[in-house]
Interface confidence: medium
């Protein structure tokens, strides 16, 4: 709306940088062949690039990434009872971001 | 995978709390009748509840929200030239979160 401008602070652009996001650990990251288990914890924090750039033709992208293995609980249900095992999930953290030109292919004339 | 357990740190649950997220300001928040304009900034930071809860039957939800009006630039293109106007967009910030029971309707027998 164009009303109530007085009370409104000027909007500040969300700059292109790493922010903490929540990553859901899906079961198929651990075992694609078996659905009869649960994962704990169900979600973890990761660092990801987000935000906007000053130009329409650029996008906020990770310029440096790091793979981080973490240990989770794989809770298998065997005869209606749980068996706890360990599994490793590799998370991707973004360490640095940059505004990168998006190359859109030109139509062939 | 169940390999390379030694190097992996135990995964820590992403607790249910407010985190900074990026909100894309879509044009229809400002003017649904006209597509011939741009918005600046295209995105802003908001506080939003995210994360997981310790229980299967609960979800991370906002327990306290605050509406925050911000002033953006509406850049109309009139005869191939930009005309700058002000517009207000109301953002929703989450101030507090809680793990709330999700009531799943039981099938009628």
């Amino acid at each position: 709306s164009l009303g109530s401008l007085a009370a409104a602070e000027p909007a500040v652009i969300a700059e292109c940088k790493t922010r903490t996001e929540v990553f859901q650990i899906s079961r198929n990251l651990i075992d694609r062949t078996n659905a009869n288990f649960l994962v704990w914890p169900p979600c973890v924090e990761v660092q990801r690039c987000s935000g906007c750039c000053n130009n329409r033709n650029v996008q906020c992208r990770a310029s440096q990434v790091q793979m981080r293995p973490v240990q989770v609980r794989k809770i298998e249900i065997v005869r209606k009872k749980p068996v706890f095992k360990k599994a490793t999930v590799t998370l991707e953290d973004h360490l640095a971001c940059k505004c990168e030109t998006v190359v859109t292919p030109r139509p062939v004339t | 995978s169940l390999g390379s357990l030694a190097a992996a740190e135990p995964a820590v649950i992403a607790e249910c709390k407010t985190r900074t997220e990026v909100f894309q300001i879509s044009r229809n928040l400002i003017d649904r009748t006209n597509a011939n304009f741009l918005v600046w900034p295209p995105c802003v930071e908001v506080q939003r509840c995210s994360g997981c809860c310790n229980n299967r039957n609960v979800q991370c939800r906002a327990s306290q929200v605050q509406m925050r009006p911000v002033q953006v630039r509406k850049i109309e293109i009139v005869r191939k030239k930009p005309v700058f106007k002000k517009a207000t967009v109301t953002l929703e910030d989450h101030l507090a979160c809680k793990c709330e029971t999700v009531v799943t309707p039981r099938p009628v027998t």
Epitope: W40, I75, R79, F84, K85 | N54, N55, R56
Partner: antibody
Framework: EVQLVESGGGLVQPGGSLRLSCAAS????????MSWVRQAPGKGLEWVSY????????YYADSVKGRFTISRDNSKNTLYLQMNSLRAEDTAVYYC?????????????WGQGTLVTVSS | SYELTQPPSVSVAPGQTARISCSGD??????VHWYQQKPGQAPVLVIY???NRPSGIPERFSGSNSGNTATLTISGTQAEDEADYYC?????????FGGGTKLTIKR
């Protein structure tokens, strides 16, 4: 204050029955799995039984299977252990303990225990 | 049934490092927890998930777990660390405790 308080222990004859209770306070009882653990005089810890947060999952040590029944009443914030066909070797301090997650995990909160003596 | 084996006793001088072992078949595949119990008291969790310390537990307590052996390490032992220590793992359908280790601080 977050705590667990056991009650119901005492002297019982072999073959007799006893019902232990564990009153929880200071936390959302219905969100946690619970266990009973016992300790015979001068001996080590022995896990007895487990129940999930909603009571849907229960399991028992082989030594008590078929004789003991674990249950919970989330509306009363109380955990129970019904002990039947008691034997001399069931003599122990019985602790109720809390798991931090619905599925189990470590025991992060313990009661002070209640003594059960099975003797004629 | 699954068994966890601990040494019955460990003795250490004050200020020295105490190591208490806990062994079991492929124990490194499971999460191990450690409990401290002083005479006449309920057990207290000191390490969970192999190496994590609950809040309120001193930094001198640490843990590790790989292969067939988990280890509780107490660096710079103090007189108040004298207690029984139990390892525990949730394996196949049951919580299993080790037999316990009595830690004595030599005076």
């Amino acid at each position: 204050e977050v705590q667990l308080v056991e009650s119901g222990g005492g002297l019982v004859q072999p073959g007799g029955s006893l019902r232990l209770s564990c009153a929880a306070s200071g936390f959302t009882f219905s969100s946690y799995a619970m266990s009973w653990v016992r300790q015979a005089p001068g001996k080590g810890l022995e896990w007895v039984s487990y129940i999930s947060d909603d009571g849907s999952l229960k399991y028992y040590a082989d030594s008590v299977k078929g004789r003991f029944t674990i249950s919970r009443d989330n509306s009363k914030n109380t955990l129970y252990l019904q002990m039947n066909s008691l034997r001399a070797e069931d003599t122990a301090v019985y602790y109720c303990a809390r798991h931090p997650y619905w599925y189990g995990g470590q025991l992060d909160l313990w009661g002070q225990g209640t003594l059960v003596t099975v003797s004629s | 049934s699954y068994e966890l084996t601990q040494p019955p006793s460990v003795s250490v001088a004050p200020g020295q490092t105490a190591r208490i072992s806990c062994s079991g078949d492929s124990l490194g595949s499971y999460f191990v927890h450690w409990y401290q119990q002083k005479p006449g008291q309920a057990p207290v969790l000191v390490i969970y998930d192999d190496s994590n310390r609950p809040s309120g537990i001193p930094e001198r307590f640490s843990g590790s777990n790989s292969g067939n052996t988990a280890t509780l390490t107490i660096s710079g032992t103090q007189a108040e660390d004298e207690a029984d220590y139990y390892c525990s793992a949730f394996t196949h359908n049951s919580d299993v405790f080790g037999g316990g280790t009595k830690l004595t601080i030599k005076r």
